[in-house]
Amino acid sequence: DAEQKACPPGKEPYKVDEDLIFYQNWELEACVDGTMLARQMDLVNEIPFTYEQLSIFKHKLDKTYPQGYPESLIQQLGHFFRYVSPEDIHQWNVTSPDTVKTLLKVSKGQKMNAQAIALVACYLRGGGQLDEDMVKALGDIPLSYLCDFSPQDLHSVPSSVMWLVGPQDLDKCSQRHLGLLYQKACSAFQNVSGLEYFEKIKTFLGGASVKDLRALSQHNVSMDIATFKRLQVDSLVGLSVAEVQKLLGPNIVDLKTEEDKSPVRDWLFRQHQKDLDRLGLGLQGGIPNGYLVLDFNVREAFS
């Protein structure tokens, strides 16, 4: 085992030097010291070591810092950041925005989305603020990473970031995340009026409450069926047929193609069939006429 071999006489390096390129892997394992590497990260990045050699160095650093790298080392990582895993990053404590931006620059275009996201999450966890500069530094990474942050981390995300979020970015968000992001979006777009407001907020409507949707239905927004399908079931089922008619406007006809799929199906189950019949779309699955519905939330109690 490489660990058991002793460093050959005269081979102990006192600094990171080019001669290390020509060490055999077992010699690097036996001779190189993690604290020396940490002190001279700039040289580790400059000297053309192979992936294999760099992974030995990483193993050395991991052994030297089993609790995670200190910020003084993280600041110096440079291109070595590419050899670090998201799991490693979760152990870090990063407080400097400059460190984050420097490492995000390194990760750009390197298929390192997971590391970049982990780094930002770790920074937010330490009380840092995700500013627009940082979002720009995250570059082409879809903002779906917002859904990976803990709800606490999300509180640190400024509302202004909501302007950059696209419809697909929130597809994998939990209900709790959507609720928080919706609140942020509301405050981000508070000075936007009319249809422009709806265009911006519709990405976040999966986090809207029944009260918010009712208010929205008063504004002739003509919501498309794709947005309607993203609404949370709990909010949707609280809307009456008249309210949904107002919300969808001419797009109401698209309900027919979705009647057997959630959340449209869930909404239909809660409407009186006579109200659905008035729409003239042939929608089925409502509460039969003359029935009384008592909702004791039995299903929730046993789920």
């Epitope: 080019e18 001669d19 390129i21 020509f22 990045n45 400059e46 053309p48 192979t50």
Partner: antibody, heavy 115, light 112 residues
Framework: QVQLVQSGAEVKKPGSSVKVSCKAS????????FSWVRQAPGQGLEWMGG????????NYAQKFQGRVTITADESTSTAYMELSSLRSEDTAVYYC????????WGQGTLVTVSS | DIALTQPASVSGSPGQSITISCTGT?????????VSWYQQHPGKAPKLMIY???KRPSGVSNRFSGSKSGNTASLTISGLQAEDEADYYC???????????FGGGTKLTVLG
């Protein structure tokens, strides 16, 4: 101030050998990588091989394998490049350079191979 | 074998910016950050201008900058000056032969 000073120009006959020296001053010698690069008239740069004086073992570009020998003398901080079986297409300026990044270069040695 | 491709020539007027590209593959330029750039004036030894993709040695003007995107490294010279007219070579480290590989070189002409 780091300086690499190379030996003077040489005129050689085809089939013979040439040995060019490169004396380093103003910096550590043993742990650095020293390369030899050549440039034929009007052509680009071509890496030939290199050595870490501390270890003494050199590595070579495939093209020159068997024909080039790179050595180093730690006591005089000098690297050497010997090229054998010379042919006319070996006419070039030969440079030594320090470190893998080649941060310092010698002034170059013109080797002319002509019958 | 590694091959780095550079344009044979580029030109620009004084004050302008020019960019010289150096294209390799994902296992050399794209995979590592060991790209260097050298300037060579006629009859002179090459001079290191950029190393590790984007680092400038002390004494090199900040008009010279290096970057990399995917498998292509670039050298940008801003505020072009007459003395920038020279040949420029990119190079990377070839781990298979443990040595340096150079691009074919680019002749920069400063018009004027």
């Amino acid at each position: 101030q780091v300086q690499l000073v190379q030996s003077g120009a040489e005129v050689k006959k085809p089939g013979s050998s040439v040995k060019v020296s490169c004396k380093a001053s103003g910096g550590t010698f043993s742990s650095y990588y020293f390369s030899w690069v050549r440039q034929a008239p009007g052509q680009g740069l071509e890496w030939m091989g290199g050595i870490i004086p501390k270890f003494g073992s050199a590595n070579y570009a495939q093209k020159f394998q068997g024909r080039v020998t790179i050595t180093a003398d730690e006591s005089t901080s000098t690297a050497y490049m010997e090229l054998s079986s010379l042919r006319s297409e070996d006419t070039a300026v030969y440079y030594c350079a320090r470190r893998t990044s080649m941060d310092y270069w010698g002034q170059g040695t013109l080797v002319t191979v002509s019958s | 074998d590694i091959a780095l491709t550079q344009p044979a020539s580029v030109s620009g007027s004084p004050g302008q910016s020019i960019t010289i590209s150096c294209t390799g593959t994902s296992s050399d330029v794209g995979g590592y950050n060991y790209v260097s750039w050298y300037q060579q004036h006629p009859g002179k030894a090459p001079k290191l201008m950029i190393y590790s993709v984007s680092k400038r040695p002390s004494g090199v003007s900040n008009r010279f900058s290096g970057s990399k995107s995917g498998n292509t490294a670039s050298l940008t010279i801003s505020g072009l000056q007459a003395e920038d007219e020279a040949d420029y070579y990119c190079a990377t480290w070839d781990h298979s032969q443990m040595g340096k590989v150079f691009g074919g070189g680019t002749k920069l002409t400063v018009l004027g």
